[in-house]
Interface confidence: medium
Amino acid sequence: DWVVAPISVPENGKGPFPQRLNQLKSNKDRDTKIFYSITGPGADSPPEGVFAVEKETGWLLLNKPLDREEIAKYELFGHAVSENGASVEDPMNISIIVTDQNDHKPKFTQDTFRGSVLEGVLPGTSVMQVTATDEDDAIYTYNGVVAYSIHSQEPKDPHDLMFTIHRSTGTISVISSGLDREKVPEYTLTIQATDMDGDGSTTTAVAVVEILDANDNAPMFEPQKYEAWVPENEVGHEVQRLTVTDLDVPNSPAWRATYHIVGGDDGDHFTITTHPETNQGVLTTKKGLDFEAQDQHTLYVEVTNEAPFAVKLPTATATVVVHVKDVNEAPVFVPPSKVVEVQEGIPTGEPVCVYTAEDPDKENQKISYRILRDPAGWLAMDPDSGQVTAVGTLDREDEQFVRNNIYEVMVLAMDNGSPPTTGTGTLLLTLIDVNDHGPVPEPRQITICNQSPVRQVLNITDKDLSPHTSPFQAQLTDDSDIYWTAEVNEEGDTVVLSLKKFLKQDTYDVHLSLSDHGNKEQLTVIRATVCDCHGHVETCPGPWKGGSGGGGSGAGVIAVIVVVVIAIVAGIVVLVISRKKRMAKYEKAEIKEMGEMHRELNA
């Protein structure tokens, strides 16, 4: 039949060439002379001329050695034609399979591989994978099947078989326990790849295995015992720095120390933190220490790492003996702030209170007292007993020194220690109100029309507290009630002043007496300007003009001047008399008002 089975040809054949492979034969050669030819890649197309055919015999020829790694299979077509060139057979498939020879060594993908593994891991832990390739066939033969092995290990600590390599995958694993980064941080493995599944050609490479740090070293105190001296009462005082060493990687969680006070600090006086750079434990006072209560503290401090220990490790403990240094402590007022109720205006020399301090020190020190700040100068303090007495008039209404009824005084206590120390206390005097102020109207000057006048509403103020204030009562005195009326409103906090009779344009004094709920009376003179106008007015219109029936003669002018001069003289006489009479009337009220003003100015 015009059929050829696949032809297998080994690569790298030694010849001689051309080498006969197979004969093409058409059974049509009985009838006519047949000529054979081949076409396809390797025959008449690239790579040309690898194969040929003897035209008349049909022998398929190989002209040169084959390379499977270049072309593993050739697909040609055989042709048969008669003498006249007519095709006598259909083109025939000729498959030439190039069989593999082990003509390539394995090649590692890198000369040096790097990998890493945590120290102290268990045998079987994977480290890294290496790869070697072989161009030879690994499907039908073992020529390209690579087997991996470890040729050598450096260093050989703790022994020379710390790692193994999977012979077919190239995965390097830990085979023995004992990897210790602190002893050997890096291993060099010379690895081999051998084809023929371990029986053929060998190539080598290097695998560097870095041993990574695990927290397999506990921090250790150096030294383990400390002694420190701390002055009493100081908060935030650095007591001691505790030093540890740790063989793990600096600045890693396996190296960074965490400190805990595990004993000796029942009063929660101390705290310990880790210094971010030195890794030391910084022991400080959280509260002030009290020499008188306890002059020595023995602390037990434990150190661990931020990261948990990778293996079971002992925890280091340090002892810190803290000696408390005695300090002359300041006397302390009891209470630090004392509130005392006292009536305003008490007599000079009257006792206010006793305010004393205690000295925390064990020695019976003498304490002396004095006033440190007394803004109004109202008080004195006995240096031995701490007795506070009044030396001025305590005035609740004195707004310069009293706030919300409270007068604040700062007192000082000093011991006789060496050096002496002082403590301060605050005395808060709550001043109890006394009805020492009468009601006062506001404003004290009014302007009013003498025709259809508008009622004048005056506010009433009283510096005292209830019940020494409203309701108020009003009364007009010194004949002011002839022309005026004064009424207190329903709420009792304003007074309404009204003009009840015509008064010519002029300024008048209205004598108004106001009394509070506690009958404290206050006389006030209201200056009333009466204007020639109707209804409401702010200021009087222009000067008042009298009528004149005269013409324009000189005699008339002289007459007018004479009248004006007489009027002026008469007016002066009347004013003097009137003034004397008013002085006599209002002297008592004005003196009292001046007294009030004088006190206000002093304040």
Epitope: Q110, D111, T112, R114, S116, E154, P155, D157, D180, R181, E182, K183, V184, P185, E186, T188, V206, V208, E210, D213, L247, V249, P250
Partner: antibody, heavy 123, light 113 residues
Framework: VQLLEESGPGLVTPSQSLSITCTVS????????INWVRQPPGKGLEWLGV???????NYNSALKSRLSITKDNSKSQVFLKMTSLQTDDTARYYC?????????????????WGQGTTVTVSS | ELVMTQSPSSLAVSVGEKVTMSCKSS????????????LAWYQQKPGQSPKLLIY???TRESGVPDRFTGSGSGTDFTLTISSVKAEDLAVYYC?????????FGGGTKLEIK
């Protein structure tokens, strides 16, 4: 100040052994690895080996069979021993401190070197 | 072992000039896990021991003047001196610490014209 100082015999006869001591100050051998490097006259540098903080060693494979590096942490001394010297071992021998013990420190880089000690192998 | 090749073996420059020298490794010194190149540069002045200039291929050692710059990655590395001073007369070595044994280049001798 970190200092390294080598001390050696100066002259060694062929086939004999060489012992060099490197004494360090300013740092601890428990914190930093120490390398040995040599330089033949007028030539380049050749790394011989390293001793790690925990006492482990790595050697140049070409010289491994003849080299031994040990140390005494308490004395701050590192020792190089080399056997079967030949004339081509004539060189200036340096000890050099690694930048650190960890890979991320660049531990293969050497930041402090001794002044070196000259070793001449001659009969 | 890894082979380090430096070029040129020597060069002469005038003070103030910029100079570059090359170092090639027989395989990549870049470790993919940390993206670092395991290469150092040293300066050895006549009669002195070597001095570390650069590590991790481009990190300048403390105290080294900033005119010294290291660059490159993989297999090709360069040391540049931006403006040469008379005191820079020395032999410059590169060194790989990617794989054992650590190996040095043959050196580049810098001479001043």
């Amino acid at each position: 100040v970190q200092l390294l100082e080598e001390s050696g015999p100066g002259l060694v006869t062929p086939s004999q052994s060489l012992s060099i001591t490197c004494t360090v100050s300013g740092f601890s051998l428990t914190s930093y690895p120490i390398n040995w490097v040599r330089q033949p006259p007028g030539k380049g540098l050749e790394w011989l080996g390293v001793i790690w903080t925990g006492g482990g060693t790595n050697y140049n494979s070409a010289l491994k069979s003849r080299l031994s590096i040990t140390k005494d942490n308490s004395k701050s001394q590192v020792f190089l021993k080399m056997t079967s010297l030949q004339t081509d071992d004539t060189a200036r021998y340096y000890c050099a401190k690694s930048r650190g013990v960890y890979d991320f420190d660049g531990r293969g880089a050497m930041d402090y070197w001794g002044q070196g000690t000259t070793v001449t192998v001659s009969s | 072992e890894l082979v380090m090749t430096q070029s040129p073996s020597s060069l002469a420059v005038s003070v103030g000039e910029k100079v570059t020298m090359s170092c090639k490794s027989s395989q990549s010194l870049l470790y993919s896990s940390n993206q670092k190149n395991y290469l150092a540069w040293y300066q050895q002045k006549p009669g002195q021991s070597p001095k570390l200039l650069i590590y991790w291929a481009s990190t300048r050692e403390s105290g080294v003047p900033d005119r010294f710059t290291g660059s490159g990655s993989g297999t090709d590395f360069t040391l540049t001196i931006s403006s040469v001073k008379a005191e820079d007369l020395a032999v410059y070595y590169c060194q790989q610490y990617y794989s054992y044994p650590y190996t040095f280049g043959g050196g580049t001798k810098l001479e001043i014209k």
